[in-house]
Every structure is written in structure tokens, then in C-alpha cells.
């Protein structure tokens, strides 16, 4: 009897949908695997007789519940199928946005770039998929614990009237208010402000 794949899960970030599993202990030899998806009531092969322990399902439609399954095989024997259901638009992890930061005197000027999507045109981003897409920004004075959060209305934001000659750190994430779903934070970007632009009297 061939044992089934173990720890079967979907690892999906920005609609790059990778079904992953672990090979079970099997004394007779090396196992291969077949992974399938349900399409119009018929299971279709996606990865056949692979020695890998993952299979790319990024070409699935983004909406709808998908049934995926994987089994282990050895010679003419095979395990039972292990099934999972997956809805990309609900289940995919929202990766960190890109961010450009520029210092102008005592202000930080930030521009945000929504994450790109696997198997899409360059300009079709996560912002196009989710109508309610917005950004959360948090910033803090480097070396302090107190963080301030803002929700920009646009793809850019300016933090004004900051302390001169002080290093501030900023990070951004995508947020979907209608789903109350937050994405991953970007890596902090830390920049030092320069002088206060106000002219002395």
C-alpha cells in the first residue's frame, strides 16, 4: 500500500499558487506524484508523475472554489488522493507593496506600488483585482517604539513637518477594508530628514 502525501497545503502569494506537500516514508523506493484540479466536473492533470513535492496552479481562475488533489505513486500502485479546496481571491496572501521614498527637507515623500500578479500583464496589479484596495502606512522615529499609522487616499503620501536631521522609518502594506484583510508589510525604509525649510524672521 502506497502512503498518501503528507502536509498538503496551498502556498499562494499574489496569485502565485503553489500546491505543496511532503513525501511520506516509503521503504520500497522513490515515490512520484500526480496533482490534479477539478474542471467542469472532471479532474485534469496539472503535474504528472513528478518527483517534485510541489505543483504550480497559478493558471487557475482567481474567483471560485477550486478542488485540487494529489496522490503518491510507485510502479503500478498509488495512494488515495488527498483533496484540498482553494479560493484564490479569498486565500491568496497579499504580498508587500513596493515603495519609493524621497526626502525633501523636513518631509518624506512616498509613492506606493501595488504588488504585481503572477501570469498577468505588467500593469495589472493587486489593485485591479480588489476594488476596495487601499494602503496602510506606519512610520516611526528610528530607535523608538512608538509607531504612527495612516491610511493614504492615493498611491502617494507626504509626511510633513517632521523633526529635522532625524531618521524616520516607513513601511506599507495593502489593506482590503471590505474583507478586513491585511497584506504583508514591506521592509522598512529609513531616511534622515534634513533642515527645516521655514525661513527665520
Amino acid at each position: 500500500m502506497v502512503p498518501p502525501p503528507e502536509n498538503v497545503r496551498m502556498n499562494s502569494v499574489n496569485f502565485k499558487n503553489i500546491l505543496q506537500w511532503e513525501s511520506p516514508a516509503f521503504a520500497k523506493g522513490n515515490l512520484t506524484f500526480t496533482a490534479q484540479y477539478l474542471s467542469y466536473r472532471i479532474f485534469q492533470d496539472k503535474c504528472m508523475n513528478t518527483t517534485l513535492t510541489e505543483c504550480d496552479f497559478s493558471s487557475l481562475s482567481k474567483y471560485g472554489d477550486h478542488t485540487l488533489r494529489v496522490r503518491a505513486e510507485f510502479a503500478d500502485e498509488h495512494s488515495d488522493w488527498v483533496n484540498i479546496t482553494f479560493c484564490p481571491v479569498d486565500d491568496t496572501i497579499i504580498g508587500p507593496p513596493g515603495m519609493q521614498v524621497e526626502v525633501l527637507a523636513d518631509s518624506l515623500h512616498m509613492r506606493f506600488l501595488a504588488p504585481k500578479i503572477e501570469n498577468e500583464y505588467e500593469t495589472w496589479t493587486m489593485k485591479n483585482v480588489y476594488n476596495s484596495w487601499t494602503y496602510n502606512v506606519q512610520y516611526w522615529k528610528n530607535g523608538t517604539d512608538e509607531k504612527f499609522q495612516i491610511t493614504p487616499q492615493y498611491d502617494f503620501e507626504v509626511l510633513r513637518n517632521l523633526e529635522p536631521w532625524t531618521t524616520y522609518c516607513v513601511q506599507v502594506r495593502g489593506f482590503l477594508p471590505d474583507r478586513n484583510k491585511a497584506g504583508e508589510w514591506s521592509e522598512p525604509v529609513c531616511e534622515q530628514t534634513t533642515h527645516d525649510e521655514t525661513v527665520p524672521s
Epitope: 474567483y63 500593469t123 485591479n128 476594488n131
Partner: nanobody
């Protein structure tokens, strides 16, 4: 059931232009995303362009960027694909597709309704 009807295909010389149209028969083209795809002889389906109803944004495959323009005329319930500087490699059957959800642009899996296609041949 929605029926999409493409028109405007034909034979054109390299460097020439064509304008394809996509209309919904007896229905409004009121879908979040309308896309154009093409299938060259012996090849798979390839995404060409799409237009989003929510913000009017347009998106293109690298192979057609700067040469093709997608647009929509809501008063005529029609989406157009203006194709300029045509090349032999643009020869294909061109399909219009509509998405109910508007989540995707390039992948055929994200579209729900399809037209029958119109042939475009670029040859001298």
C-alpha cells in the same frame, strides 16, 4: 446567455492597420473586464489586451504594446481593438471575452463568455 460577436478581421499587408469590434448581441457589454485574445495557427491562446470598466485602465501584452489600442464606446456597447503596424506574427484568430468578476486580465481562465473569433491575416 450572453453572445459576443467580433468583426473587423481580414487580410492586411505588413505595416497596415485594422480595427476589431466586439459587441454583445441583444445585451449590454456591462462587464468588469473585457479582453482580447488571439490564437495563431498551431499555437495556444495568447492574451493581447484588456480594459477595466471600473477605472477605464488598459493593459497590453509586451508583444503589442505601442501598436495596439483597446477602447470602449459605452453608447454603442462595443469594445474596439485598434491594431497598427501589423506584422506577420500578428496573424491569428482574435477572440473577445468578458469576465463576470473582473479579477484577471491576461489569463483565459478568468473569463466567462467568449466570441467565435475573427480571422486576421497579415501578409504581402
Amino acid at each position: 446567455e450572453v453572445q459576443l460577436v467580433e468583426s473587423g478581421g481580414g487580410l492586411v499587408q505588413p505595416g497596415g492597420s485594422l480595427r476589431l469590434s466586439c459587441a454583445a448581441s441583444g445585451n449590454s457589454l456591462d462587464y468588469p473586464t473585457i479582453g482580447w485574445f488571439r490564437q495563431a495557427p498551431g499555437k495556444g491562446l495568447e492574451g493581447v489586451s484588456c480594459i477595466s470598466a471600473s477605472d477605464g485602465s488598459t493593459h497590453y501584452a509586451d508583444s503589442v504594446k505601442g501598436r495596439f489600442t483597446i477602447s470602449r464606446d459605452n453608447s454603442k456597447n462595443t469594445v474596439y481593438l485598434q491594431m497598427n503596424s501589423l506584422r506577420a506574427e500578428d496573424t491569428a484568430v482574435y477572440y473577445c471575452a468578458a469576465s463576470l468578476w473582473g479579477a484577471g486580465c491576461k489569463s483565459e481562465a478568468d473569463y466567462d463568455y467568449w466570441g467565435q473569433g475573427t480571422q486576421v491575416t497579415v501578409s504581402s
